[in-house]
């Protein structure tokens, strides 16, 4: 009876276990009892990344600059091209088929993690004692100014969006306070 299974680097065809084509090559003709599988290298801008019996190689991915994409790693006969996004943009999916502008953190929020080519900016609310008064993709929350270290007093309390306002100490009040 003919074989029903083959080894891992083989495939079953016409009751024969034929060798698969190596990565970077495509199938031209199946083996016979007396001839080996015939394979041919993939052309320029084509690839196959597994042991295979494909009759056509896959086209390398095109990194479309109109979608904000650029080449991160050039493809070979065995690997696909890897795209990434232009500076200031990040991929919308794992496959990186298009890009979107990094989000900015609004006033009252600071950057927890700066965006990369594949991940967006992560913002966090500024906690008590910190503020952010700008919309930015890079700025963290800044600590309120310490009036005391400047020998000044707080004239206006800070918020998550504004710094404290320091002013000179009231001399009279300061004097009476000490007497």
């Amino acid at each position: 009876e003919p074989p029903t299974a083959c080894r891992e680097k083989q495939y079953l065809i016409n009751s024969q276990c034929c060798s698969l084509c190596q990565p970077g090559q495509k199938l031209v003709s199946d083996c016979t009892e007396f001839t080996e599988t015939e394979c041919l290298p993939c052309g320029e801008s084509e690839f196959l990344d597994t042991w295979n019996r494909e009759t056509h190689c896959h086209q390398h991915k095109y990194c479309d600059p109109n979608l904000g994409l650029r080449v991160q790693q050039k493809g070979t006969s065995e690997t696909d091209t890897i795209c990434t996004c232009e500076e200031g943009w990040h991929c919308t999916s794992e496959a990186c088929e298009s890009c979107v502008l990094h989000r900015s953190c609004s006033p009252g929020f600071g950057v927890k993690q700066i965006a990369t080519g594949v991940s967006d900016t992560i913002c966090e609310p500024c906690p008590v004692g910190f503020f952010s008064n700008v919309s930015s993709a890079f700025e963290k929350c800044h600590p309120w100014t310490s009036c005391e270290t400047k020998d000044l007093v707080v004239q206006q309390a800070g918020t998550n969006k504004t710094d404290v306002v320091c002013g000179p100490q009231d001399r009279l009040r300061h004097h009476h306070h000490h007497h």
Partner: antibody, heavy 127, light 107 residues
């Protein structure tokens, strides 16, 4: 050092069962296809069974089909041969052997061979 | 199933002799053939794979040739350690099969 060590052999009555084990060391066991091959006393080699690296694909010699089951546990680096309904003609030294795929990137020679063998375990089926 | 027939079944030769063992397949197997050496009480040892490729560490006096249905194993100059039994095996398709063996004895 790349090594295979069989165990589980012994004397068993006809109709009985036995489970052979093969412990692999010194290589990434889960990346290799494996085989069982036996040799009756004073006789030649007889291929018994095959299992793919994942355990998904198995095949058997006609003489043991339906009675023997090959399996593997890649997390423990172990290969097994469950032998049921044993017969006198199953008496043999049982070897586990590693299948290796020799790959020449020039594409001239892609071929299989069994490059690593255990020392064997003796199975005797007798009443 | 594919049958492999080895010849001769046994062979007597002297140190320094050139020896050829043949293996014939019942159907074409391209170059999917391996040769093994086995000594008493020991497991087989792979010598040749893909009909003609020498396994690493095997002395160059061993060589294999052939394709399709007819294959040969040649030992160019026999050494004392070469006296053993030799088997061919087809790995073309399941069930994998071995030849019946050729016992090489010292004259």
């Amino acid at each position: 050092e790349v090594q295979l060590l069989e165990s589980g052999g012994g004397l068993v009555r006809p109709g009985g069962s036995l489970r052979l084990s093969c412990a692999a060391s010194g290589f990434t066991f889960g990346s290799y296809e494996m085989n069982w091959v036996r040799q009756a006393p004073g006789k030649g080699l007889e291929w018994v069974s095959y299992i793919s690296s994942s355990g998904e694909t198995t095949d058997y010699a006609d003489s043991v089909k339906g009675r023997f089951t090959v399996s593997r546990d890649n997390s423990k680096n172990l290969l097994y041969l469950q032998m049921n309904s044993l017969r006198a003609e199953d008496t043999a030294v049982y070897y586990c052997a590693r299948d290796v795929f020799f790959f020449d990137s020039s594409g001239d020679n892609h071929a299989y061979g069994m490059d690593v063998w255990g020392q064997g375990t003796m199975v005797t089926v007798s009443s | 199933d594919i049958q492999l027939t080895q010849s001769p079944s046994s062979l007597t030769a002297s140190v320094g002799d050139r020896v050829t063992i043949t293996c014939r397949s019942s159907q074409g197997i391209r170059s999917s053939l391996a040769w093994y050496q086995q000594k008493p009480g020991k497991p087989p040892k792979l010598l040749i794979y893909g009909a003609s490729s020498l396994e690493g560490g095997v002395p160059s006096r061993f060589s294999g040739s052939g394709s399709g249905t007819d294959f040969t194993l040649t030992i160019s100059s026999l050494q004392p350690e070469d006296f053993a039994t030799y088997y061919c095996q087809q790995l073309n398709s399941f069930p994998s099969t071995f030849g019946q063996g050729t016992k090489l004895e010292i004259k």
